[in-house]
């Protein structure tokens, strides 16, 4: 499998309608909890909770404040801790507890505390709770939590160090944690934890489980350096624990790797950064996709991998045992374990078999059957994902999270779209076409370039939304920007399943906003862009230099896959210097200004999907070159001459008869053409025009083809 | 109703072996979860735990008199029989045998027998 | 070895409360369980599992634990609660039950 291209299109983030909600002097933005039916944003962050409109975020409806007290923080002071910023309270649990009210845990300067947030007030109960368990005590230190029936399951550290991780479940009549032990957890980085809800009517009684990711020291591999390992955990929710071995710890514990890897390369990714599960009606068992980095990442390799819940289940129900032999010098290594297993089955949760051998509760499991599960919480098998290969590798990017919606195209094809956020506050919208990976766009989230620390979807129809927080704020942005496409090849060569183009209004439409979503509407996922209407009619600049001065054509193509060159009077323009250079490496300047240098210029795109190459005349330019004879008196022109050579700029619009895209032969000069190659990086604002006509008509002329105006967005 | 009654030597000496028998009815020792346990109480003093054996056939002894205590079962009979070698004046208690509840009904020493008194003299 | 301990005696009057200790490390990762007994007859469960009070056991008996003690709360004692107390628990370590020193209860 190939690295994934760059992304199609790069919109800046002032370049497209992004809400943002921060607060002076409040920091990491990092628990966010979407109540879909109250369209509630819930945002925890450093010292506060805030209430916001989900379906504009910039609405705050309430706030409150937990700040830590000053003998608190002096007391942390004193441990070593900074007053400044580790001795807050960072809030690190915000889950669901009731229809009134949240679950809240923070840091709480290094004395984790938990409270209830009653949502009709908007103010903590002040239980102030012991968080120990279900909050890590430094806000440094990796967590993860998930509300199940009225009861936390966490996975964070015990101890102010943060040296002992735990798997906990916080319940009134059956609390359970994980042996403190390294074959259970052995310095784990916690990512995510989700519970996946039996069917009821599930032929073997089965019982709900809650799942848990993360990264820790591999036991079963040993080198010179640590090796790290992404696992996926499992519990059972009716778990009550032994009654004599494993009292109060979970019998239901088991791990397995997450294996994601390249394998004609070599190429492991075994550090896991992030997790989605996705749930969809047209999907029997979820898949979860997740978010990996190589554990030498000095490229900044990223890869996101697919798996079907089922397999890890297998692996759970049958899969082998791993156990640990002591070999010389009192070594332990870890191998497959081929002798009997107990019944019932170590690990296994209780289900309608185990029902009818007695086996009502874990707390009447035979003490073989638990002591095994102690002795062996690794399984041999691993998790593979589906296809057995990654769904993307991206180079020369650092993914921190992901959200994945799942979504129908208008030929009826399901896509799975991916929303991966990256370490420099973008966010990259990849599908998978074909068995090749097209990242459709990346959105500047924040202008400051900071890691995406938490990233959520919105799951209501109607207006969708990612939500993602960072260091200094949140901020909303829609599924797709399909108004930004201007034309028809604009939103086909797209390629997003979100937008199709409608004709009789001559826009792209996000799908999920029409109507009748597929009367009359145009996608086409392969790109083919020859599905778009006839136009006859296209726009161009005419511009007034005066002679000897210098002229710049602006050219705004938005792909980075595509190739932007120049004609003029329909033959490629060679780079010739001193006459021509690039401007922000698709604007043309014409240096030296000449009566020869009037005419027609026009810039031509040329982009490929799949085997077909896509023209394009993005912008038409009409150049006329005057000899000004240098007047006597101060001109009346000078406000228009904001560009020294430049006299004036209108815009004509006429039919173009005789325009065509260029024939290869034309095409190929690749010795003397000025031409752009595809660009990795956003662009910049280089690009911005000038001066800024806002009332271009955008308009097409013949397929595959159109005339745009150069400062369109 | 459970019920559960010890039975042995009142009176054993130095250095003999004391052999206890538990004999239960109400409750089986083959139904999953169940187990019977021997608990002892010098006079005047605490509670100390000796040994347990469950319906699976697990056994557990107290640390520090492991080497001393044999504890077994026969099913068909309904007894469970407690051995401790090489008396002391100071194992003189009331030895009491108890049923432990299946966990699911919490585990706990559900029924005690009236307890047996020992001693060991010469 | 593990060591449960609790308070020789409690001293309480009719009507008051009485709370009965019982201290070990880490306790709270284990379940606690607290038996009475009169003279002369065998214990008798009251709290299991930490908090949970046995069927016929009056309201009156309570149970907790935290951190490294557990905690046995008569509330409102009456006469007929004079007894030996006894806590217990399954130490996983040495695959053994523990019982606490004992704490006698007087209501005065």
């Known amino acids: 499998m190939a690295f994934a291209p760059i992304p199609r299109i790069t919109w800046e983030h002032r370049e497209v309608h992004l809400v943002q909600f921060h607060e002076p002097d409040i920091y990491n933005y990092s628990a966010l909890l979407l109540s879909e039916d109250k369209d509630t944003l819930y945002i925890g962050a450093r010292e506060a909770v805030f209430a916001v409109n989900a379906l504009n975020i910039s609405e705050k409806q309430h706030e409150v404040y937990w700040k830590v007290s000053e003998d608190k923080k002096a007391k942390c002071a004193e441990k070593g801790k900074s007053k400044q910023t580790e001795c807050l309270n960072y809030i690190r649990v915000l889950q669901p507890l009731s229809a009134t009210s949240l679950y809240v845990c923070g840091t709480n300067a290094f004395q984790p505390a938990c409270d209830h947030l009653n949502l009709t007030s908007f103010k903590f109960l002040g239980k102030n709770e012991d968080g120990k368990g279900r909050c890590p005590f430094d806000p440094a230190h990796s967590y993860t939590s998930v509300m199940v029936d009225g009861e936390l399951y966490s996975g964070t550290s015990y101890n102010f160090l943060g040296s002992e991780p735990i798997i906990s479940r916080n319940s009134s009549h059956s609390p359970l944690r994980t042996e403190y032990a390294i074959p259970w957890l052995n310095e784990p980085s916690f990512v995510f934890a989700d519970v996946i809800r039996k069917s009821p009517d599930s032929p073997d009684g089965e019982d709900d489980r809650v799942y848990f990711f993360f990264t820790e020291v591999s036991v079963e591999y040993e080198f010179v350096f640590r090796v790290l390992i992404p696992r996926i955990a499992r519990v059972c929710k009716g778990d009550q624990g032994g009654l004599r071995t494993l009292q109060k710890k979970w019998t239901s514990f088991l791990k397995a790797r997450l294996i994601c890897s390249r394998p004609d390369s070599g190429l492991v990714f075994n550090v896991l950064r992030d997790v989605f599960v996705l749930r969809s009606p047209g999907l029997k068992v979820p898949v979860f996709y997740a978010l990996f980095t190589p554990q030498l990442n000095n490229v900044g390799l990223s890869a996101v991998c697919a798996y079907n819940l089922s397999t890890a289940e297998e692996v759970f129900s049958h899969g082998k045992y791993m156990q640990s032999t002591t070999v010389e010098q009192s070594h332990t290594k870890w191998v497959r374990y081929n002798g009997p297993v107990p019944k019932p089955r170590p690990g296994a949760c209780i289900d309608s078999e185990a029902r009818a051998a007695n086996y009502t509760s874990s707390l009447n499991l035979p003490d073989k059957t638990l002591q095994f599960v102690k002795d062996h919480p690794l399984m041999d098998d691993s998790v593979t994902p589906i296809d057995n290969r990654p769904r993307l590798i991206k180079k020369d990017v650092n993914y921190t999270q992901i959200v994945v919606d799942r979504t129908q195209a208008l030929d009826g094809t399901v896509y799975d779209v991916m929303f991966v956020s990256t370490d420099r506050g973008a966010l990259h919208k990849a599908i998978s076409l074909e068995h090749a990976v097209h990242i459709i766009e990346e959105t500047q989230l924040f202008q400051d370039f900071e890691p995406v620390q938490t990233l959520l979807l919105s799951s209501k129809k109607g207006n969708r939304f990612v939500y993602a927080g960072s260091n200094s704020g949140v901020v909303q942005a829609p599924l797709a920007f399909c108004g930004k496409h201007g034309t028809c090849e604009d939103c086909v060569l797209a390629r997003d399943p979100y937008c199709a183009w409608s004709p009789p209004t001559a826009t792209c439409v996000a799908l999920h906003q029409t109507e009748s979503p597929s009367r009359g509407l145009i996608q086409e996922m392969s790109g083919d862009a020859s599905v778009c209407p006839d136009k006859s009619k296209g726009s161009y600049r005419q511009h007034f230099f005066k002679h000897g001065g210098t002229a710049e054509l602006k050219c705004s193509q938005k792909s980075n896959l595509a190739r932007v060159f120049w004609k003029f009077q329909n033959g490629v323009l060679k780079a010739e210097s001193p006459k021509y250079g690039l401007m922000g490496r698709k604007n043309l300047l014409i240096f030296n200004l000449s009566e020869g240098d009037s005419g027609v210029y026009q810039c031509l795109s040329e982009e490929r999907v799949k085997n077909k190459t896509v023209f394009q005349v993005v912008a038409k330019h009409v150049l006329e070159v005057k000899v000004v004879p240098k007047p006597v008196v101060a001109p009346t022109l000078s406000v228009v001459q904001t560009e020294g050579s430049r006299i004036a700029t209108k815009v004509l619009v006429a039919s173009t008869q005789g325009s065509s895209p260029p024939t290869p032969a034309v095409q190929a000069t690749s010795s003397g053409a000025i031409t752009l190659p595809p660009k990795p990086a956003p662009t910049g604002t280089s690009c911005e025009p000038k001066i800024v006509i806002n009332t271009v008509p955008q308009l097409h002329s013949e397929k595959t083809m159109y005339l745009k105006s150069s400062d369109n967005r | 109703q459970v019920t559960l009654r010890e039975s042995g030597p009142a009176l054993v000496k130095p250095t003999q072996t004391l052999t206890l028998t538990c004999t239960f009815s109400?409750?089986?020792?083959?139904?999953?979860?169940?187990?019977v346990t021997w608990i002892r109480q010098p006079p005047g003093k605490a509670l100390e735990w000796l040994a347990l054996?469950?319906?699976?056939?697990?056994?557990y002894y107290s640390t520090s008199l492991k080497t001393r205590l044999t504890i077994s079962k026969d099913t068909s009979k309904n007894q469970v029989v407690l051995t401790m070698t090489n008396m002391d004046p100071v194992d003189t208690a009331t030895y009491y045998c108890?049923?432990?509840?299946?966990?699911?009904?919490?585990?706990?020493?559900?029924?005690w027998g009236q307890g047996t008194l020992v001693t060991v003299s010469s | 070895s593990y060591e449960l301990t609790q308070p020789p005696s409690v001293s309480v009057s009719p009507g008051q409360t009485a709370s009965i200790t019982c201290s070990g490390d880490?306790?709270?990762?284990?379940?606690v369980y607290w038996y009475q007994q009169k003279p002369g007859q065998s214990p008798v469960l009251v709290i299991y599992?930490?908090?949970k009070r046995k069927s016929g056991i009056p309201e009156r008996f309570s149970g907790s634990n935290s951190g490294n003690t557990a905690t046995l709360t008569i509330s409102g004692t009456q006469a007929m609660d004079e007894a030996d107390y006894y806590c217990?628990?399954?130490?996983?370590?040495?695959?053994?039950?523990?019982f606490g020193t004992g704490t006698k209860v007087t209501v005065l």
């Open positions: 108890a049923r432990i509840a299946s966990g699911d009904s919490g585990g706990y020493f559900a029924d």
């Open positions: 109400g409750f089986s020792l083959t139904t999953t979860g169940v187990a």
């Open positions: 054996i469950d319906w699976d056939d697990d056994k």
């Open positions: 880490k306790l709270d990762d284990k379940y």
């Open positions: 599992m930490d908090n």
């Open positions: 217990q628990a399954w130490e996983s370590s040495s695959d053994q039950y523990v």
